[in-house]
Interface confidence: low
Amino acid sequence: MSLLSVPHTESVSLSTGSTVTIKGRPLVCFLNEPHLQVDFHTEMKEDSDIAFHFQVYFGNRVVMNSREFKIWKEEVESKNMPFQDGQEFELSILVLEDKYQVMVNGQAYYNFNHRIPVSSVKMVQVWRDISLTKFNVSN
């Protein structure tokens, strides 16, 4: 199976019903504190606003947030850790009318209410300490 380069960035156009699917594996064991970060940007620039920020501190916690005008907003944290040490994962982010529904390995994980209109999302970036085997957007 061929690996995608990380960081991986793609132009996207999201609307209600869209699903972003990411499949990969942590590069190192959880003792070494690998991270996964997924950002939904409003422009094709890394310093642009982020409608949805999803960061996994593998084996520890998951943090979700948004960034507007370069300012991070109220952080949401979950200690629920659905990712398994050394195991491949499938992360799906479903765009619902009022929120993003995050699924991990087919199981509902968290709902994050929209703070920035989904229609403004232009780019998704997946990065940090993972090997990436799949990135797909279905509308």
């Epitope: 995608l4 380069s5 960081p7 991986h8 960035t9 793609e10 132009s11 620039k45 890394e46 970036q125």
Partner: nanobody, 121 residues
Framework: ELQVVESGGGLVQAGGSLRLSCAAS????????MAWFRQAPGKEREFVAA???????TYADSVKGRFTISRDNAKNTVTLQMNSLKPEDTAAYHC???????????????WGQGTQVTVSS
């Protein structure tokens, strides 16, 4: 190892056209996504256009409808056709090759020295 060299820059009046070319050396050219970035004096490097291995492309909002990116895998070249040029398009234009289709400069491993485009009003 891939080497990229840009050409085709120059001085043009507003409303005019230029065609930039990027020649790549290396048999692996077709396995790379390619992009054009530009950098004006005192400003950070800015994404212009990118093209996938198979020819899918995307553009910065500021050039959409005016610029066209294309590639010829047989000739190891990428071109950027620039029409309806504006003074704000003035910059050094850099061609880049990378393993992923991206808008982020650090995703690209190989860079050309750049070709200067100056648009006068």
């Amino acid at each position: 190892e891939l080497q990229v060299v840009e050409s085709g820059g120059g001085l043009v009046q507003a409303g005019g056209s230029l065609r930039l070319s990027c020649a790549a050396s290396g048999r692996t050219f077709s396995t790379y996504s390619m992009a054009w970035f530009r950098q004006a004096p005192g400003k950070e490097r800015e994404f212009v256009a990118a093209i996938t291995r198979s020819g899918g492309n995307t553009y910065a909002d500021s050039v959409k409808g005016r610029f066209t990116i294309s590639r010829d895998n047989a000739k190891n070249t990428v071109t950027l056709q620039m029409n309806s040029l504006k003074p704000e398009d003035t910059a050094a234009y850099h061609c880049a090759a990378g393993g992923t289709y991206s808008f982020v400069p650090r995703s690209y491993n190989y860079w050309g020295q750049g070709t200067q485009v100056t648009v006068s009003s």
